[in-house]
């Protein structure tokens, strides 16, 4: 007569996280009397998953009714599988005996692998803004996936990037894995509306990759160009001087007018014009009362953009071109007036 055999027909099974795993086990005989127990792992450190004789195992249900006479099916179903449940499960027949059960026979084991979806990729850029022509690094991270095989791609505005390095951790076996990738991106002046995309493809995603994005508007700083011009005379003894601040990003900008090196007025950019590429323009102007000046005036438009060192542009205003008339400016008040058009 053949003695009892423990049959685990599945060498391995793969289950998606959150689902239930069914581990099959049948025995070929009702003898010897004694319980079936399920373990994860082998050896002295093995973890008890289910004991037919006693104990409370809230996540485990038996596939068959073990109270049914002649039952030889000891398959179990484990609910709400997580990556931590991965491992090799053994169905073990014990022989009833005092003082402790004697292990009688073990099945060959069933390896449970857990398919866990990667978390949504998180893309982060540099801490400080950078200007066009500079190379900046973006990182992409995704966690908690299994199995280890995963594909990560970088795109800028739909164009695939090639300058990146990717690591999947840990290197050895684990219940779940993480991916970390760093891509290098060269900024251009047109990148305010650009996006950097990290795309992760994994077997659990059924061909629908996950994407994480970063807007380059959070990273780029486009410094302004300045142009100071003198407008035609508005009225006798008055000259209109404008400072055109063009193609800057982000909006944060402070402008100071200096008259012969002395601060005349400071204003913060408010009503801006947006360009198609996402940059901004702004214009500030001054009405200069030339009759208040005996000598030529050096007007300087000084701009501090996004906390960076100030840039400036100057304009020499020739007073001699406008002969001074005594008493023409008897009204009290400043020699310079300014306004910024709405």
């Amino acid at each position: 007569e053949e003695e009892l055999q423990v049959i685990q027909p599945d060498k391995s099974i793969s289950v998606a996280a959150g689902e239930s795993a069914t581990l099959h086990c049948t025995v070929t005989s009702l003898i010897p009397v004694g319980p079936i127990q399920w373990f994860r792992g082998a050896g002295p450190g093995r973890e008890l998953i289910y004991n037919q004789k006693e104990g409370h195992f809230p996540r485990v249900t038996t596939v068959s009714d073990l109270t049914k006479r002649n039952n030889m099916d000891f398959s179990i179903r484990i609910s709400n599988i997580t990556p931590a449940d991965a491992g090799t499960y053994y169905c073990v027949k014990f022989r009833k005996g005092s003082p402790d059960h004697v292990e009688f026979k073990s099945g060959a084991g069933t390896e449970l692998s857990v398919r866990a979806k990667p978390s949504a990729p998180v893309v982060s850029g540099p801490a400080a803004r950078a200007t066009p022509q500079h190379t900046v690094s973006f990182t992409c991270e995704s966690h908690g996936f299994s199995p280890r095989d995963i594909t990560l791609k970088w795109f800028k505005n739909g164009n695939e990037l090639s300058d990146f390095q990717t690591n999947v951790d840990p290197a050895g076996d684990s219940v779940s894995y993480s991916i970390h990738s760093t891509a290098k991106v060269v900024l251009t002046r047109e990148d305010v509306h650009s996006q950097v995309i990290c795309e992760v493809a994994h077997v659990t995603l059924q061909g629908d990759p996950l994407r994480g994005t970063a807007n380059l508007s959070e990273t780029i700083r486009v410094p302004p160009t300045l142009e100071v011009t003198q407008q035609p005379v508005r009225a006798e003894n008055q000259v209109n001087v404008t400072c055109q601040v063009r193609k800057f990003y982000p909006q944060r900008l402070q402008l100071t007018w200096l008259e012969n090196g002395n601060v005349s007025r400071t204003e913060t950019a408010s009503t801006l014009t947006e360009n198609k590429d996402g940059t901004y323009n702004w214009m500030s102007w001054l009405l200069v009362n030339v009759s208040a000046h005996r000598d030529d005036v050096k007007l300087t438009c000084q701009v501090e953009h996004d906390g960076q060192p100030a840039v400036s542009k100057s304009h020499d205003l020739k007073v001699s071109a406008h002969p001074k008339e005594q008493g023409s400016n008897t009204a009290p008040g400043p020699a310079l007036a300014s306004a910024a058009p709405l």
């Epitope: 070929t28 003898i31 009833k96």
Partner: antibody, heavy 115, light 111 residues
Framework: RQLVESGGGLVQPGGSLRLSCAAS????????ISWVRQAPGKGLEYIGT?????ITYYASWAKGRFTGSKTSSTAYLQMTSLRAEDTAVYYC????????????WGQGTLVTVSS | DIVMTQSPSSLSASVGDRVTITCQAS????????LAWYQQKPGQAPKLLIY???TLATGVPSRFSGSGSGTDFTLTISSLQPEDFATYYC???????????FGQGTKVEIK
């Protein structure tokens, strides 16, 4: 499905007897066969269970004098050094207790130990 | 060895009565549920009624029920029928595979 015992009868004290238990309608290969006896006018008494190979065990009082064996169709109980107090109806039953209870029983065979 | 004590040893009851028989083990039975109940009529082999303390055997009428765990067990016949007059035995199993002991029996007689 049934079990049919045979081999009972009159035996002298100190003598031996071999009881048979034939199964029909099912195979004994995946089941234990247990032996239970009942002295006249008394209650039931468990003797032992015959499984496969080394899986054979007996109540403490029966060790040494009672040995069992089985094939896929028949189980046997060998009894030696019989005494008057062994006089009883001997039953075979399919099962080995706990989750494998004694569900099919033979009709019993009477063993009388007397000089 | 485990010792099983049944009570009462006999009882008289009428058809339709609710009958309760108890069985006490000298130690916890194996798995707290290694307890079966058998019915035996004169000149017949025993018949399995209940196993694993409360599982009804195939073909047994639902008026029979078993309960209990550890050391104390009960067989209940909810409404005694004429064919239920017989002797009832509990069989308890200890931790050792050979440690199986019957109670002394409870004879249910017609009042």
């Amino acid at each position: 499905r049934q079990l049919v015992e045979s081999g009972g009868g009159l035996v002298q004290p100190g003598g031996s007897l071999r009881l048979s238990c034939a199964a029909s309608g099912f195979s004994l290969s995946s089941h234990g066969i247990s032996w239970v006896r009942q002295a006249p006018g008394k209650g039931l008494e468990y003797i032992g269970t015959i499984g496969t190979g080394v899986i054979t065990y007996y109540a403490s009082w029966a060790k040494g004098r009672f040995t069992g064996s089985k094939t896929s169709s028949t189980a046997y109980l060998q009894m030696t050094s019989l005494r008057a107090e062994d006089t009883a109806v001997y039953y075979c039953a399919r099962g080995s207790a706990w989750n494998d209870p004694f569900d099919y029983w033979g009709q019993g065979t009477l063993v009388t130990v007397s000089s | 060895d485990i010792v099983m004590t049944q009570s009462p040893s006999s009882l008289s009851a009428s058809v339709g009565d609710r009958v309760t028989i108890t069985c006490q083990a000298s130690q916890s039975v194996y798995g707290n549920n290694d307890l079966a109940w058998y019915q035996q009529k004169p000149g017949q082999a025993p018949k399995l009624l209940i196993y694993l303390a409360s599982t009804l055997a195939t073909g047994v009428p639902s008026r029979f029920s078993g309960s209990g765990s550890g050391t104390d067990f009960t067989l209940t016949i909810s409404s005694l029928q004429p064919e239920d007059f017989a002797t009832y035995y509990c069989l308890g199993g200890g931790d050792d595979e050979a440690d199986n002991t019957f109670g002394q029996g409870t004879k249910v007689e017609i009042k």
